[in-house]
């Protein structure tokens, strides 16, 4: 079998959901000494980066300008050290948002419920879409999907304090083209005093996987980056559409 280098890690900087006409930035974290990085879109070459000097950085950032539906889809990257190529990274799904219209999100029986109550979110959009998506802030990888002509429902079942947080929904025109986000709906779940006080609150920052951890080479940083690359490859989870 042909020898290959370890696969790089591909990430979206900040978020994989990019408003149309805004810039997306994808990071490909490979190896110190890589002389070339390639970004592929839907299996075809999209961009090439040849860092100079190559030994100083363990990855590159690819800017994707003017986001639109033609640039939304599945990206991957590879890198080369000398004449040796890496395996292909996992696929990253890049989504364009703020397409066409804005849905309305509501919750039944209401935004304030007690632990154990059954809750259902309703997302409504009066334009031609049949797929709806519900996201919880700080958990943008955990997308719930539902189908309906102009409205979809998202039954949550009996909720716990872990369900507390801010939710938004989108209408989806295809897997990679989403509407404007709805206005957020904040779900407040009250339980007994002990549970409520101990329940962790969700972070409002994006997923920790959506950050670029590129480092310049120093002795310590090289060790940390190697550890980070190994750990991330081991634990990396990716949402597939």
């Amino acid at each position: 079998p042909k020898q290959t280098l370890p696969k790089p890690i591909i990430r979206a900087e900040s978020t994989y959901m990019v408003p149309k006409e805004k810039q997306a930035t994808l990071c490909c974290q490979g190896s110190y000494g890589a002389v070339e990085y390639q970004l592929h879109f839907e299996g075809s070459l999209f961009a090439v980066e040849r860092p100079k000097p190559p030994e100083r950085i363990n990855g590159v950032k690819f800017h994707i300008p003017d986001m639109n539906s033609r640039k939304a889809g599945r990206y991957s990257c590879i890198y080369r050290v000398g004449e040796l190529w890496s395996e292909r990274s996992d696929l990253l799904d890049l989504v364009v948002t703020e397409m066409y219209d804005t849905p309305t999100l509501s919750v039944h029986p209401g935004p304030e419920v007690t632990s154990g109550e059954k809750v259902t979110f309703y997302c409504r959009l009066d334009t031609a879409t049949s797929m709806f998506l519900l996201l919880k802030e700080g958990r943008s990888r955990d997308v719930q999907r539902s189908y309906g002509k102009v409205q979809a429902e998202f039954p949550m079942g009996p909720v716990t304090t872990a369900h507390r947080g801010s939710y938004r929904c989108f209408g989806s025109y295809n897997n990679y083209a989403w509407s404007f986000p709805s206005e957020p709906v904040k779900l407040l779940v009250t339980g007994d005093i002990e549970n409520t006080s101990l329940a962790p609150t969700d972070p409002t920052f994006p997923d920790s996987w959506d950050t670029c951890l590129l480092t310049r080479e120093t002795g310590l940083q090289k060790d940390l980056a190697l550890w980070d690359h190994t750990a991330q490859n081991h634990h990396h989870h990716h949402h597939h559409h």
Epitope: Q23, F41, S44, L45, F46, A47, V48, E49, R50, P51, K52, V60, K61, F62, H63, I64, P65, D66, R70, K71
Partner: nanobody, 130 residues
């Protein structure tokens, strides 16, 4: 608005050389990655060559590697495509293109996908005869 104007096309014999120029106005040319594409008769548009804004990275389609050379003069807001040892299959309309946005692009990045480019010239016809 951005204008890209190609020139230098024409009718040549197989084995001859030709140099295409692409004059850009309306944007900060010196910070834009650039590319050349072509569309032959009855064919899809295909990537030919690309160059980073600093000229430090160039990239070529396999079919033109070793024969075509892309360059740029940021002082003149112009990109060039030097085409040597032309073949019959190089007959096409050649387009230059500039990557969109107003980003601080890396000095070493090139874009090979047509969808990455926002602004296009009107094209110049290159015909190679035997």
């Amino acid at each position: 608005d951005v204008q890209l104007v190609e020139s230098g096309g024409g009718l040549v014999q197989a084995g001859d050389s030709l140099r295409l120029s692409c004059a850009v106005s309306g944007r900060t040319f010196s910070r834009l990655p650039m590319g050349w594409f072509r569309q032959g008769p009855g064919k899809d548009r295909e990537f030919v060559a690309a160059i980073s804004w600093s000229s430090s990275t160039t990239y070529y389609a396999d079919s033109v590697k070793g024969r075509f050379f892309i360059s740029r003069d940021n002082a003149k807001n112009t990109a060039y495509l030097q085409m040597n040892n032309l073949r019959l299959e190089d007959t096409a309309v050649y387009y230059c293109a500039a990557v969109g946005g107003s980003l601080d692009y890396s000095a070493t990045v090139v874009y090979t996908a047509a969808r990455a480019y926002a602004d296009w010239g009107q094209g110049t016809l290159v015909t190679v005869s035997s």
